[in-house]
Interface confidence: medium
């Protein structure tokens, strides 16, 4: 028998430095948890502890801290080539900056193979891209050799921005010839490595003939056997267990996300590549764990340029960008306006000529806003100031919803209106009426949402059954401010960019701005 | 010069507690590794465990539940503690400078001249 | 754990002969960095050990050019070209390849 170690990460957005446990700016330092410092020691330790080793990442490393804000993917390949990663999956955010952001600072710098057996490169870019990213990639490992093959979501497209000469194909249609390949180069021990989330995970472990094991990412799915250390609940035990349909036992097995754990699986191999065990969990990378002072030097030095960007002015605003909890939490603000606006923006993608766009609506909890703006100030606005309006380092989503979904979250809005409460929906894309005479669960009067499968934008009465594309919050998307209806009815739940970095790069490509307050929330009757 | 000096207690008293301190000079704790190995009278080595520069420690599987090995780097001190003594765990107890660099080498370079523990009622 | 076996258990020299001395492990030492993690130890009467070779066969400083280590996965020989009296003791291999390193059971190296 032949024993391997995966290490694994995915789903990091950008976390290099430590972080609070529910992965946000780390304040009190004994209490931290994750980044890149720690995570080397772990990994270090575990390296010397045992002999076949591989560090895996399943993609999603991009976006969402001002990390990547500002080194745009050049902090990813050098923190990844010093931790030594093996492998790396390429996950829908590494596609935010277009095909050139992924190709100059990570694909060319990094020094592991990147890997994608379902993006097929087309046109102009065949050439350019070629040989920078992989479909599989043989790994010797002591006295053996494994085959990770990759594959990223086709939802790409309509995720983040991969142009139009990337294809993005069906993963197991794509995985398939490319693991026949490996068994042909007699390659027996096969790991998929990818970034498409843990149903289909699932599918690829139970589908594709000759994969052994299946490291995943992009759902932030927390699996573990046993008593879990901090707050994420698990969905399953750690590994998955998958009967494939040739009847082998696949384990399946991702690490939650922001680098908060290292995934651990061991896998016993017997001599002709057949999986005979596998066991381990995920390591909470807690303060117990100390950082490595060299990581954490660079670490250090790195963060001098943030601090700088920070105060630098990225546009100016001509109005007062009222985000006075007085304002956002009781009717229409500009700030709510603002920010929706550049949550559509930021969505925009123009996938087929059927639709202007994929998406056109945005709801957010005015309690989520959490200051204002004064243009007094040579109307500068700068990233310290908008993570000020937004200091929870939260990402603006992508949900499927239906109608109805949305009719019961606009009830949700108002019913106890009045009270100063964070539940009241700032929106975009959206006209909403509210008669607050009625009883609470009866106040939406009128609610029209603004149409995608149209040439020219209008808004249309909201159809209950009609599912609905979404822009919103994560807090939202995962029942926060008491939208339980969101969290339980969502049909489909993809995490987006990080929320300051949508605002700012809207205000830094529009230069000025001028938000009004345009009728987009009214109530009737004369009840307000 | 790299030096490593124990200091035990000489004699212990089965199901007592077991406390070794190695001092070091010439090399810092927060670089280097220091590992721990023992020595049965006229028999062979054993491994015990591993206190990393980074404080990070790898322990045999065996001894797991009762070994724990901590450090103070600033009196370049590292200290051994083994619970629940037996006769068996009679041996000379030696550590070693253990040479690292990041996860390629390591190995025990320079050992202490160890210190002779007798477990005995 | 890996068994280290050394062999022979004891070896008889005179000064100035060749002495091999030879270790197998139960399963290859070869980590997936590359590294190959078997090193030789001498340890003489009352002394603790000394490190001779790490790695298969890089030596230690000061340690001198008659000493020399090879071999691979799981099978490796030490070599003294020729024998001084400062050289006899017990010789241990040992592994660092993976949690827990072990040693071998050591080769008596002594005058005939």
């Known amino acids: 028998a032949w024993e391997l170690t995966i290490l694994h990460t995915n789903d990091v957005h950008s976390r290099l430095e430590q972080t609070s446990e529910d992965s946000s700016k780390c304040v009190n330092a004994s209490r931290c948890m994750g980044g890149v410092a720690r995570l080397f020691t772990k990994v270090q330790q575990i390296r010397r502890a045992e002999p076949n080793v591989l560090l895996l990442d399943a993609g999603d490393q991009y976006q969402g801290t001002i990390w990547f804000t500002v080194y745009k993917g050049a902090e990813v390949a050098h923190f990844m080539n010093a931790l030594r990663y093996d492998a790396m999956a390429l996950g829908n955010h590494e596609f935010d900056n277009g095909v050139e952001g992924l190709i100059e600072p990570l694909l060319k710098e990094a020094k592991f193979p990147i890997l994608s057996a379902n993006i097929k490169a087309k046109g102009p870019l065949a050439s350019q891209i070629s040989g920078l990213y992989l479909p599989y990639k043989v790994l010797p490992v002591g006295d053996e050799v494994v085959g990770i093959v990759g594959y990223t979501s086709k939802e790409t497209p309509f995720l983040s921005n991969p142009g139009t000469n990337l294809v993005f194909e069906d993963e197991i249609t794509a995985l398939q010839p490319e693991v026949d390949k490996l068994k042909t180069l007699n390659v027996n021990k096969i790991i998929a490595l990818g970034h498409s989330g843990f149903e289909m995970d699932k599918l690829i472990a139970q589908k594709v003939r000759g994969v052994d094991v299946v490291v995943g990412g992009h759902s932030n799915t927390f699996l573990y056997t046993g008593n879990p250390p901090s707050k994420e609940v698990p969905a399953g035990k750690y590994p998955f267990i998958v009967t494939s349909d040739d009847g082998r036992k696949v384990p399946v097995v991702q690490a939650y996300a922001f680098g908060k754990y290292l995934g651990y699986l061991k896998i016993e191999f017997d001599e002709r590549g057949n999986v005979i065990s596998s066991h381990g969990n995920p390591i909470l990378l807690n303060s117990s764990i100390p950082e490595d002072p060299s990581i954490k030097a660079d670490i250090n030095k790195w963060r001098i340029k943030l601090d700088n960007y920070s105060t630098q002015e990225l546009g100016k605003t001509i109005v007062y960008l009222d985000g006075s909890s007085q304002s956002c939490r009781f009717r229409e603000c500009n700030m709510g306006n603002l920010i929706c606006d550049a949550m559509i923006n930021n969505n925009l993608r123009h996938t087929d000529e059927m639709f202007w766009n994929h998406v056109s609506m945005c709801i957010l909890n005015g309690g989520g806003i959490r200051s204002p703006i004064d243009e007094r100030n040579n109307g500068t606005i700068t990233w310290e100031n908008l993570a000020a309006v937004l200091p929870f380092g939260g990402t603006f989503d992508l949900v499927q919803l239906k109608g109805s979904t949305l009719k019961k979250a606009f009830e949700h809005s108002v019913h106890r209106y009045g009270q100063s409460t964070g539940e009241f929906l700032q929106v975009g894309g959206i006209h909403v009426v509210y008669d607050l005479s009625r009883k609470p669960g009866d106040r939406v009067v009128k609610l029209d949402v603004l149409c995608t499968k149209c040439r020219v934008p209008s808004y249309d009465p909201l159809k209950m059954d009609e599912v609905y594309k979404v822009i919103l919050p994560n807090f939202l998307a995962n029942g926060g401010d008491g939208f339980q209806m969101i969290k339980d009815e969502l049909l489909r739940h993809d995490s987006g960019d990080q929320d300051i970095n949508v605002v700012s790069t809207y205000i830094s490509k529009m230069k000025v701005i001028y938000p009004a307050v345009e009728g987009r929330i009214k109530f009737s009757t004369g009840s307000h | 010069d790299v030096q490593l000096v124990e200091s035990g207690p000489g004699l212990v008293a089965p199901s007592q507690s077991l406390s070794i301190t190695c001092t070091v000079s010439?090399?810092?704790?927060?670089?280097?590794?220091v590992s721990w190995v023992r020595q049965p009278p006229g028999k062979g080595l054993e491994w015990l465990g591993v206190i990393w520069g980074d404080g990070s420690t790898n322990y045999h599987s065996a001894l797991i539940s009762r070994l724990s090995i901590s450090k103070d780097n600033s009196k370049s001190q590292v200290f051994l503690k083994l619970n629940s003594l037996q006769t068996d765990d009679t041996a000379t107890y030696y550590c070693?400078?253990?040479?690292?660099?990041?996860?390629?080498?390591?190995?025990?370079?320079?050992w202490g001249a160890g210190t002779t523990v007798t477990v005995s009622s | 754990d890996i068994v280290m076996t050394q062999a022979p258990l004891s070896l008889p020299v005179s000064l100035g002969d060749q002495a091999s001395i030879s270790c197998r492990s139960s399963q290859s030492l070869v980590h997936s960095n590359g590294n190959t993690y078997l090193h030789w130890y001498l340890q003489k009467p009352g002394q603790s050990p000394k490190l001779l070779i790490y790695k298969v066969s890089n030596r230690f400083s000061g340690v001198p050019d008659r000493f020399s280590g090879s071999g691979s996965g799981t099978d490796f020989t030490l070599k003294i070209s020729r024998v001084e009296a400062e050289d006899l003791g017990v010789y241990f291999c040992?592994?660092?390849?993976?949690?827990?390193?072990?040693f071998g059971g050591g080769t008596k190296l002594e005058l005939k």
């Open positions: 070693a400078k253990t040479n690292i660099f990041y996860d390629y080498d390591w190995y025990l370079d320079v």
């Open positions: 010439g090399f810092s704790l927060t670089s280097y590794g």
């Open positions: 040992s592994h660092s390849t993976h949690v827990p390193w072990t």
